[in-house]
């Protein structure tokens, strides 16, 4: 970040595969980070035929693709995985799809949790 | 530094069982899962499993599930990973990998090595 | 499972060329996937992850580039210790997979 001290964030968390994986299902995730590292949060998802599936959520690793994003926009035009990343304490909330060869845009909002966090 | 040693290397008899350790060093040893890849000579690298220091937990590869057994020792920052019913094809190189504590998880720690042979 | 195509499966080339080396997932993988170099005898080090970010202290001739399924690593000005066999690597789901390898070789 520049900022020289250790970057901490917190992200919402998602893992759709998390029996397999052996994680936690959903809940926030804090995010520490090392010295002058960025930490991001992210979203993934299908989309199909207009039925979202959540793929996973959570912190991501300092990524320049990320930077000064201050919400978590998709912008692949058809993509099997659609990912956006932002920076902020839970901006993958939510997510959005808004193609860079234009159409419509596409925001998914995600309903009430109580969400706990994780260790 | 962050670092990942491993034991030497072994010369083992079809049927039998091999156990390699992996110590890490200067890092939290329960923030980081550890992973075990293996590289058979001559031959590309394949991802074998994990393990979360943490709470224990694994899952290993469709391939070696049954013969596999990772386990890990937070009191000494040791993982291990057991490969029982040993045949010639699992002579190899194992690495112990660490894991980025967050997505996309990139294995960005790797021990030296335990060459494992296995032969009649 | 996911399979990982890495071509061309070896590279010669020449100190100072630009080197190409792709990448395509059987599905797609967004942006989990990683680079790793390795040198005869030694370990696979960590070059880029989440397909295009530099990992520390990685020499910034290394790029990465791609989404979904199809990647590339490019070397834009190849040194002579970067002769060495190169692999991709997606994490986007278990069981983790490797693409073949590609060695870059001197010319």
């Known amino acids: 970040s520049g900022r020289g001290e250790a970057e901490t964030r917190e992200c919402i968390y998602y893992n759709a595969n998390w029996e397999l994986e052996r994680t936690n299902q959903s809940g926030l995730e804090r995010c520490e980070g090392e010295q002058d590292k960025r930490l991001h949060c992210y979203a993934s998802w299908r989309n199909s035929s207009g039925t979202i599936e959540l793929v996973k959520k959570g912190c991501w690793l300092d990524d320049f693709n990320c930077y000064d994003r201050q919400e978590c926009v998709a912008t692949e035009e058809n993509p099997q995985v659609y990912f956006c990343c932002c920076e902020g304490n839970f901006c993958n909330e939510r997510f959005t799809h808004l193609p860079e060869a234009g159409g419509p845009e596409v925001t998914y909002e995600p309903p009430p949790t109580a969400p706990t966090l994780l260790t | 530094q962050v670092q990942l040693v491993q034991s030497g290397a072994e010369v083992k008899k079809p049927g039998a069982s091999v156990k390699v350790s992996c110590k890490a060093s200067?890092?939290?040893?329960?923030?980081?899962?550890m992973h075990w890849v293996r590289q058979a000579p001559g031959q590309g690298l394949e991802w074998m499993g994990f393990?979360?220091?943490?709470?224990?937990?694994?899952g290993y590869a469709q391939k070696f599930q049954g013969r596999v057994t990772m386990t890990r020792d937070t009191s000494t920052s040791t993982v291990y990973m057991e490969l029982s019913s040993l045949r010639s094809e699992d002579t190899a190189v194992y690495y112990c990998?660490?894991?980025?504590?967050?997505?996309?998880?990139?294995?960005?720690?790797w021990g030296q090595g335990t060459t494992v042979t296995v032969s009649s | 499972d996911i399979q990982m195509t890495q071509s061309p499966s070896s590279v010669s080339a020449s100190v100072g060329d630009r080197v190409t080396i792709t990448c395509r997932a059987s599905?797609?993988?967004?942006?989990?996937l990683a680079w790793y170099q390795q040198k005869p005898g030694k370990a696979p080090k960590l070059l880029i992850y989440?397909?295009?970010s530099l990992q520390s202290g990685v020499p910034s001739r290394f790029s990465g580039s791609g989404s979904g399924t199809d990647f590339t690593l490019t070397i834009s000005s190849l040194q002579p210790e970067d002769f060495a066999t190169y692999y991709c690597?997606?994490?986007?789901?278990?069981?983790?997979?490797f693409g073949g390898g590609t060695k870059v070789e001197i010319k």
């Open positions: 393990i979360v220091p943490s709470g224990g937990s694994t």
């Open positions: 989440a397909a295009s």
């Open positions: 599905q797609g993988i967004s942006r989990w």
């Open positions: 690597q997606q994490a986007f789901s278990h069981p983790w997979t």
């Open positions: 990998a660490r894991v980025s504590r967050y997505a996309p998880e990139p294995m960005d720690v």
């Open positions: 200067g890092y939290t040893f329960t923030s980081y899962r």
